[in-house]
Interface confidence: medium
């Protein structure tokens, strides 16, 4: 039949060439002379001329050695034609399979591989994978099947078989326990790849295995015992720095120390933190220490790492003996702030209170007292007993020194220690109100029309507290009630002043007496300007003009001047008399008002 089975040809054949492979034969050669030819890649197309055919015999020829790694299979077509060139057979498939020879060594993908593994891991832990390739066939033969092995290990600590390599995958694993980064941080493995599944050609490479740090070293105190001296009462005082060493990687969680006070600090006086750079434990006072209560503290401090220990490790403990240094402590007022109720205006020399301090020190020190700040100068303090007495008039209404009824005084206590120390206390005097102020109207000057006048509403103020204030009562005195009326409103906090009779344009004094709920009376003179106008007015219109029936003669002018001069003289006489009479009337009220003003100015 015009059929050829696949032809297998080994690569790298030694010849001689051309080498006969197979004969093409058409059974049509009985009838006519047949000529054979081949076409396809390797025959008449690239790579040309690898194969040929003897035209008349049909022998398929190989002209040169084959390379499977270049072309593993050739697909040609055989042709048969008669003498006249007519095709006598259909083109025939000729498959030439190039069989593999082990003509390539394995090649590692890198000369040096790097990998890493945590120290102290268990045998079987994977480290890294290496790869070697072989161009030879690994499907039908073992020529390209690579087997991996470890040729050598450096260093050989703790022994020379710390790692193994999977012979077919190239995965390097830990085979023995004992990897210790602190002893050997890096291993060099010379690895081999051998084809023929371990029986053929060998190539080598290097695998560097870095041993990574695990927290397999506990921090250790150096030294383990400390002694420190701390002055009493100081908060935030650095007591001691505790030093540890740790063989793990600096600045890693396996190296960074965490400190805990595990004993000796029942009063929660101390705290310990880790210094971010030195890794030391910084022991400080959280509260002030009290020499008188306890002059020595023995602390037990434990150190661990931020990261948990990778293996079971002992925890280091340090002892810190803290000696408390005695300090002359300041006397302390009891209470630090004392509130005392006292009536305003008490007599000079009257006792206010006793305010004393205690000295925390064990020695019976003498304490002396004095006033440190007394803004109004109202008080004195006995240096031995701490007795506070009044030396001025305590005035609740004195707004310069009293706030919300409270007068604040700062007192000082000093011991006789060496050096002496002082403590301060605050005395808060709550001043109890006394009805020492009468009601006062506001404003004290009014302007009013003498025709259809508008009622004048005056506010009433009283510096005292209830019940020494409203309701108020009003009364007009010194004949002011002839022309005026004064009424207190329903709420009792304003007074309404009204003009009840015509008064010519002029300024008048209205004598108004106001009394509070506690009958404290206050006389006030209201200056009333009466204007020639109707209804409401702010200021009087222009000067008042009298009528004149005269013409324009000189005699008339002289007459007018004479009248004006007489009027002026008469007016002066009347004013003097009137003034004397008013002085006599209002002297008592004005003196009292001046007294009030004088006190206000002093304040």
């Amino acid at each position: 039949d015009w059929v050829v089975a696949p032809i297998s040809v080994p690569e790298n054949g030694k010849g001689p060439f051309p080498q006969r492979l197979n004969q093409l034969k058409s059974n049509k050669d009985r009838d006519t002379k047949i000529f054979y030819s081949i076409t396809g890649p390797g025959a008449d197309s690239p790579p040309e001329g690898v194969f040929a055919v003897e035209k008349e015999t049909g022998w398929l020829l190989l002209n040169k050695p084959l390379d499977r790694e270049e072309i593993a299979k050739y697909e040609l077509f055989g042709h048969a034609v008669s003498e006249n060139g007519a095709s006598v057979e259909d083109p025939m498939n000729i498959s030439i399979i190039v069989t593999d020879q082990n003509d390539h060594k394995p090649k590692f993908t890198q000369d040096t591989f790097r990998g890493s593994v945590l120290e102290g891991v268990l045998p079987g832990t994977s480290v890294m994978q290496v790869t070697a390739t072989d161009e030879d066939d690994a499907i039908y033969t073992y020529n390209g099947v690579v087997a991996y092995s470890i040729h050598s290990q450096e260093p050989k600590d703790p022994h020379d078989l710390m790692f193994t390599i999977h012979r077919s995958t190239g995965t390097i694993s830990v085979i023995s326990s004992g990897l210790d980064r602190e002893k050997v941080p890096e291993y060099t493995l010379t690895i081999q790849a051998t084809d023929m599944d371990g029986d053929g050609s060998t190539t080598t490479a290097v695998a560097v295995v870095e041993i990574l740090d695990a927290n397999d070293n506990a921090p250790m105190f150096e030294p383990q015992k400390y002694e420190a001296w701390v002055p009493e009462n100081e908060v935030g005082h650095e007591v001691q720095r505790l030093t540890v060493t740790d063989l793990d990687v600096p600045n890693s969680p396996a190296w960074r120390a965490t400190y805990h006070i595990v004993g000796g600090d029942d009063g929660d006086h101390f705290t310990i933190t880790t210094h971010p750079e030195t890794n030391q434990g910084v022991l400080t006072t959280k509260k002030g220490l009290d020499f008188e209560a306890q002059d020595q503290h023995t602390l037990y401090v434990e150190v661990t790492n931020e990261a948990p220990f990778a293996v079971k490790l002992p925890t280091a403990t340090a002892t810190v003996v803290v000696h408390v240094k005695d300090v002359n402590e300041a006397p302390v007022f009891v209470p630090p702030s004392k509130v005392v109720e006292v009536q305003e205006g008490i007599p000079t020399g009257e006792p206010v209170c006793v305010y004393t301090a205690e000295d925390p020190d064990k020695e019976n020190q003498k304490i002396s007292y004095r006033i440190l700040r007394d803004p109004a100068g109202w008080l004195a303090m006995d240096p031995d007993s701490g007795q506070v007495t009044a030396v001025g008039t305590l005035d609740r209404e004195d707004e310069q020194f009293v706030r919300n009824n409270i007068y604040e005084v700062m007192v000082l206590a000093m011991d006789n220690g060496s050096p002496p120390t002082t403590g301060t206390g605050t005395l808060l005097l709550t001043l109890i109100d006394v009805n020492d102020h009468g009601p006062v109207p506001e404003p004290r000057q009014i302007t009013i029309c003498n025709q259809s006048p508008v009622r004048q509403v005056l506010n009433i103020t009283d510096k005292d507290l209830s019940p020494h204030t409203s309701p108020f009562q009003a009364q007009l005195t010194d004949d002011s009630d002839i022309y005026w009326t004064a009424e207190v409103n329903e709420e009792g906090d304003t007074v309404v002043l009204s003009l009840k009779k015509f008064l010519k344009q002029d300024t008048y004094d209205v004598h108004l007496s106001l009394s509070d709920h506690g009958n404290k009376e206050q006389l006030t003179v209201i200056r009333a300007t009466v204007c020639d106008c109707h209804g409401h007015v702010e200021t009087c219109p222009g000067p008042w003009k009298g009528g004149s029936g005269g013409g324009g003669s000189g005699a008339g002018v002289i007459a007018v001047i004479v009248v004006v001069v007489i009027a002026i003289v008469a007016g002066i006489v009347v004013l003097v008399i009137s003034r004397k009479k008013r002085m006599a009337k209002y002297e008592k009220a004005e003196i009292k008002e001046m007294g009030e003003m004088h006190r206000e100015l002093n304040a």
Partner: antibody
Amino acid sequence: VQLLEESGPGLVTPSQSLSITCTVSGFSLTSYPINWVRQPPGKGLEWLGVIWTGGGTNYNSALKSRLSITKDNSKSQVFLKMTSLQTDDTARYYCAKSRGVYDFDGRGAMDYWGQGTTVTVSS
Amino acid sequence: ELVMTQSPSSLAVSVGEKVTMSCKSSQSLLYSSNQKNYLAWYQQKPGQSPKLLIYWASTRESGVPDRFTGSGSGTDFTLTISSVKAEDLAVYYCQQYYSYPYTFGGGTKLEIK
């Protein structure tokens, strides 16, 4: 100040052994690895080996069979021993401190070197 | 072992000039896990021991003047001196610490014209 100082015999006869001591100050051998490097006259540098903080060693494979590096942490001394010297071992021998013990420190880089000690192998 | 090749073996420059020298490794010194190149540069002045200039291929050692710059990655590395001073007369070595044994280049001798 970190200092390294080598001390050696100066002259060694062929086939004999060489012992060099490197004494360090300013740092601890428990914190930093120490390398040995040599330089033949007028030539380049050749790394011989390293001793790690925990006492482990790595050697140049070409010289491994003849080299031994040990140390005494308490004395701050590192020792190089080399056997079967030949004339081509004539060189200036340096000890050099690694930048650190960890890979991320660049531990293969050497930041402090001794002044070196000259070793001449001659009969 | 890894082979380090430096070029040129020597060069002469005038003070103030910029100079570059090359170092090639027989395989990549870049470790993919940390993206670092395991290469150092040293300066050895006549009669002195070597001095570390650069590590991790481009990190300048403390105290080294900033005119010294290291660059490159993989297999090709360069040391540049931006403006040469008379005191820079020395032999410059590169060194790989990617794989054992650590190996040095043959050196580049810098001479001043």
